[in-house]
């Protein structure tokens, strides 16, 4: 695991504890909460990050209309179960034996049930729509400059392959970033769009997960891009299964 060897820290995840007793005497960083070793050369999975967060001391329209099947994360924080690779387990349960199925970004995609609830597979979120509203500026941003800056951000800061940033839409003051990544497209070593979106979301909220780096300073041609609200929609490869009661 490539953690900064000299002072044994994890550049990509501040919610870790690192010690020089990993394989071969190398620096090994463990995610708080789970204790799983993380690869500090890339983003940590959202599941391990959520688990760490829960364990932390209580210290003409060009815009996309989200599909009817798009999910928004309304349930907020919970302490998830992660599999040995750090991914969300398909079935999540709380302390009171209430269970539900989640997608690959950990968002609930079924009604809540009891321990008899079955979640046969972890359904992949293959399309993420990040909907941002920026604070008023002197004028609108140039669309192609904005597009280039956001693509650069996802490539350089989040190490997401450019092919997974499907589109950047802009209608002042609304910006939409579309991330797409099918199961078949994701190769070993590729950053998951769900993880990149989560890091971006935390950056936007001023809660950067990166070690010792300053917060996100987004600028388009020198002009600060300040976000005042964020909505993220998640589209799964298989539509979610909610009862009609929830939809009314």
């Amino acid at each position: 695991h490539t953690a900064a060897q000299d002072n044994c820290t994890c550049p990509t995840n501040k919610m870790t504890v690192c010690s020089p007793d990993g394989p071969g005497g190398r620096c090994q960083c463990r995610a708080l909460g789970s204790g799983m070793a993380v690869d500090c050369s890339t983003l940590t999975s959202k599941c391990l990050l959520l688990k760490a967060r829960m364990s932390a001391p209580k210290n003409a329209r060009t815009l996309v209309r989200p599909s009817e099947h798009a999910l928004v994360d309304n349930d907020g924080l919970y302490d998830p179960d992660c599999d040995p690779e750090g991914r969300f387990k398909a079935r999540q349960c709380n302390q009171t034996s209430v269970c539900w199925c989640v997608n690959s970004v950990g968002v609930r995609r079924t009604d809540k049930g009891d321990l008899s609830l079955r979640c046969d597979e972890l359904v992949r979120t293959h399309h993420i729509l990040i909907d941002l509203r920026h604070r008023p500026t002197a004028g609108a941003f140039n669309h192609s400059d904005l597009d280039a800056e956001l693509r650069r951000l996802f490539r350089e800061r989040y190490r997401l392959h450019p092919k997974f940033v499907a589109a950047v839409h802009y209608e002042q003051p609304t910006i939409q970033i579309e991330l797409r990544q099918n199961t078949s497209q994701k190769a070993a070593g590729d950053v998951d769009i769900g993880d990149a979106a989560y890091y971006f979301e935390r950056d936007i909220k001023g809660e950067s997960l990166f070690q010792g780096r300053g917060g996100l300073d987004l600028r388009v041609r020198g002009e600060p891009l300040q976000v005042e609200r964020t909505l993220i929609y998640y589209l799964d490869e298989i539509p979610p299964k909610f009862s009609m009661k929830r939809l009314t």
């Epitope: 504890v17 010690s19 040995p84």
Partner: antibody, heavy 115, light 107 residues
Framework: QVQLQQSGAELVRPGASVKLSCKAS????????INWVKQRPGQGLEWIGN????????NYNQKFKDRATLTVDKSSSTAFMQLSSPTSEDSAIYFC????????WGQGTTLTVSS | DIVLTQSPATLSVTPGDSVSLSCRAS??????LHWYQQKSHESPRLLIK???QSISGIPSRFSGSGSGTDFTLSINSVETEDFGMYFC?????????FGSGTKLEIK
């Protein structure tokens, strides 16, 4: 050389709290996890929990979470485990160990809980 | 919690024999498995770390292999000083867990 020196044997009454110590030397105390392990006579090994001295991050085996408290004193490079409300089931040898692969072990502290 | 199952529970051997001790994890733990030897009235001693990495001061007759869920500790030509208990331990995730042990005894 690396050493973990544990406190001496303890005889305590049921219900009376006890605090065991583990003094580390020969390495940078704040850089490695300290773990505590329980072994009842003729039995296997049971992980109680660990503490990372730099930041005092702790993790506990659920079985011990309510009664074991792990702390450190960085100035003396000493780790402590306090066990509250002990019963006869807590009579055992308690080891402190270093790291993730437990490369160094203390000599063990024998705790006897008896009235 | 990750469960480690060691087999056999007891192994009776003659000095000079070569033996293999097994440790199986209830889920994949990559190479985050360590082996210890414990003799009566002593602290355990680390023999092998991270499934196959040798430890300085440990005789070369001890070797480890495996990854994922199946691991083996091999002792090439057992010596009398090797008799005792052997435990495996996982450090893949908290809570860390130990196997129940294999007792290596003289036949």
């Amino acid at each position: 050389q690396v050493q973990l020196q544990q406190s001496g044997a303890e005889l305590v009454r049921p219900g009376a709290s006890v605090k065991l110590s583990c003094k580390a030397s020969g390495y940078t105390f704040t850089s490695y996890w300290i773990n505590w392990v329980k072994q009842r006579p003729g039995q296997g090994l049971e992980w109680i929990g660990n503490i990372f001295p730099s930041g005092s991050y702790t993790n506990y085996n659920q079985k011990f979470k309510d009664r074991a408290t792990l702390t450190v004193d960085k100035s003396s490079s000493t780790a402590f485990m306090q066990l509250s409300s002990p019963t006869s089931e807590d009579s055992a040898i308690y080891f402190c160990t270093r790291g993730s692969g437990f490369d160094y072990w203390g000599q063990g502290t024998t705790l006897t809980v008896s009235s | 919690d990750i469960v480690l199952t060691q087999s056999p529970a007891t192994l009776s051997v003659t000095p000079g024999d070569s033996v293999s001790l097994s440790c199986r994890a209830s889920q994949s733990i990559s190479n985050n498995l360590h082996w210890y030897q414990q003799k009566s009235h002593e602290s355990p001693r680390l023999l092998i770390k991270y499934a196959s990495q040798s430890i300085s001061g440990i005789p070369s007759r001890f070797s480890g292999s495996g990854s994922g869920t199946d691991f083996t500790l091999s002792i090439n030509s057992v010596e009398t000083e090797d008799f005792g208990m052997y435990f495996c331990q996982q450090s893949n995730s908290w809570p860390f867990t130990f196997g129940s042990g294999t007792k290596l005894e003289i036949k």
